[in-house]
């Protein structure tokens, strides 16, 4: 697994550096998760031809992956800090069940998948500290998540591979949009 944020060689070599601000820490945490996703995507793409497949729509019907849209206030046009922050946190909470699904989907990158999951939990905590309106954040229902997980795990091998690919791609895209939005805050 990659070195967690704040523990890279640059930080070790430069103990005199200013401690990271809350925004920098969040930014670094997201980039750390994105690096983890890249490694997982590499294994997925090497193992199957899912990354080139045009049959994504078949698997996407089973998924309700969080997506960023204009109304969420995260784009430069119509940017709204509080609305956007709620969307980012809500989206990450919704992704947690899908990250749980990924846990048994990797052979050589099992540790990496765990690191992505745990780092996302830490990121949610960072962002919750930043949010003023925690009441607006809806937490997914555990029962619904449990049955979704069972349903995903019962799919055939091809659909499971496709689902893995789609989760990684969507999570990467969601995080990148979040990164871009948080830099405006």
């Amino acid at each position: 697994a990659p070195v967690p944020p704040g523990e890279d060689s640059k930080d070790v070599a430069a103990p005199h550096r200013q401690p990271l601000t809350s925004s920098e820490r969040i930014d670094k945490q997201i980039r750390y998760i994105l690096d983890g996703i890249s490694a997982l995507r590499k294994e997925t793409c090497n193992k199957s031809n899912m990354c080139e497949s045009s049959k994504e729509a078949l698997a996407e019907n089973n998924l309700n992956l969080p997506k960023m849209a204009e109304k969420d206030g995260c784009f430069q046009s119509g940017f709204n800090e509080e609305t956007c922050l709620v969307k980012i946190i809500t989206g990450l909470l919704e992704f947690e069940v899908y990250l749980e699904y990924l846990q048994n989907r990797f052979e050589s990158s099992e540790e990496q998948a765990r690191a992505v999951q745990m780092s996302t939990k830490v990121l949610i905590q960072f962002l919750q500290k930043k949010a003023k309106n925690l009441d607006a954040i809806t937490t997914p229902d555990p029962t619904t998540n449990a049955s979704l997980l069972t349903k995903l795990q019962a799919q055939n091998q091809w659909l499971q591979d496709m689902t893995t690919h789609l989760i990684l791609r969507s999570f990467k895209e969601f995080l990148q949009s979040s990164l871009r939005a948080l830099r405006q805050m």
Epitope: R31, M68, F75, E173, R180
Partner: antibody
Framework: EVQLVQSGGGLIQPGGSLRLSCAAS????????MIWVRQAPGKGLEWVSD????????YYADSVKGRFTMSRDISKNTVYLQMNSLRAEDTGVYYC?????????????WGRGTLVTVSS | DIVMTQSPSTLSASVGDRVTITCRAS??????LAWYQQKPGRAPKVLIY???TLESGVPSRFSGSGSGTDFTLTISSLQPEDFATYYC????????FGQGTKLEIK
């Protein structure tokens, strides 16, 4: 071959509109950040706008915000820069380019540039 | 917009010289900075990205350093083909450039 082919430049009067096109080949714009950069005659490079492939989110420089619109047509693998309310200071060579990476980008591919002249 | 301030604007040097160009960002941009070289009538060409990573095919005499707000491009031993204009560009938010440094023959 991986390349960006630009078109649409020309002479336009102040207050007028122009649309620049940038056709990509050898890669898909639907999975890449795209960017427009301009350069006034004898001056430096100025970033104009970028378009993030995911959800088509666009970001603009303050100097063009509200006047320029960057868009794309995935079926044509082409990005556009719609320029309205043009001013003399918008004159220059406009480059279409591709960001090379997602969360720490740099430009790794440039178009040849197209000249836009705003003059009466 | 993030403002990038590059210095000097013009630099006169000779072949074999070691030269340094600096770039300062108006706010912290982590390591999200690239350096480009541009010759008259041509599109720019990337030399360094992520502040210190050398682009493939770029001679090792070019190096970059810095993080946060202060960045440096160094050419260890100038070659005749290095006389050009150099730009820094941040990619933290948007993609603003420095105003450029024209490197000319002394």
């Amino acid at each position: 071959e991986v390349q960006l082919v630009q078109s649409g430049g020309g002479l336009i009067q102040p207050g007028g509109s122009l649309r620049l096109s940038c056709a990509a080949s050898g890669f898909t714009i639907s999975s890449n950040y795209m960017i427009w950069v301009r350069q006034a005659p004898g001056k430096g490079l100025e970033w104009v706008s970028d378009l993030y492939y995911y959800a088509g989110d666009t970001y603009y420089a303050d100097s063009v915000k509200g006047r320029f619109t960057m868009s794309r047509d995935i079926s044509k693998n082409t990005v556009y820069l719609q320029m309205n309310s043009l001013r003399a200071e918008d004159t220059g060579v406009y480059y279409c380019a591709r960001w090379a990476d997602d969360h720490a980008p740099w430009v790794d591919l440039w178009g040849r540039g197209t000249l836009v002249t705003v003059s009466s | 917009d993030i403002v990038m301030t590059q210095s000097p604007s013009t630099l006169s040097a000779s072949v074999g010289d070691r030269v340094t160009i600096t770039c300062r960002a108006s706010q912290g941009i982590s390591s999200w900075l690239a350096w480009y070289q541009q010759k008259p009538g041509r599109a720019p060409k990337v030399l360094i990205y992520k502040a210190s990573t050398l682009e493939s095919g770029v001679p090792s005499r070019f190096s970059g350093s810095g993080s946060g707000t202060d960045f440096t491009l160094t050419i260890s031993s100038l070659q005749p083909e290095d006389f050009a204009t150099y730009y820094c560009q941040q990619s933290w938010l948007g993609g603003s450039f420095g105003q450029g440094t024209k490197l000319e023959i002394k």
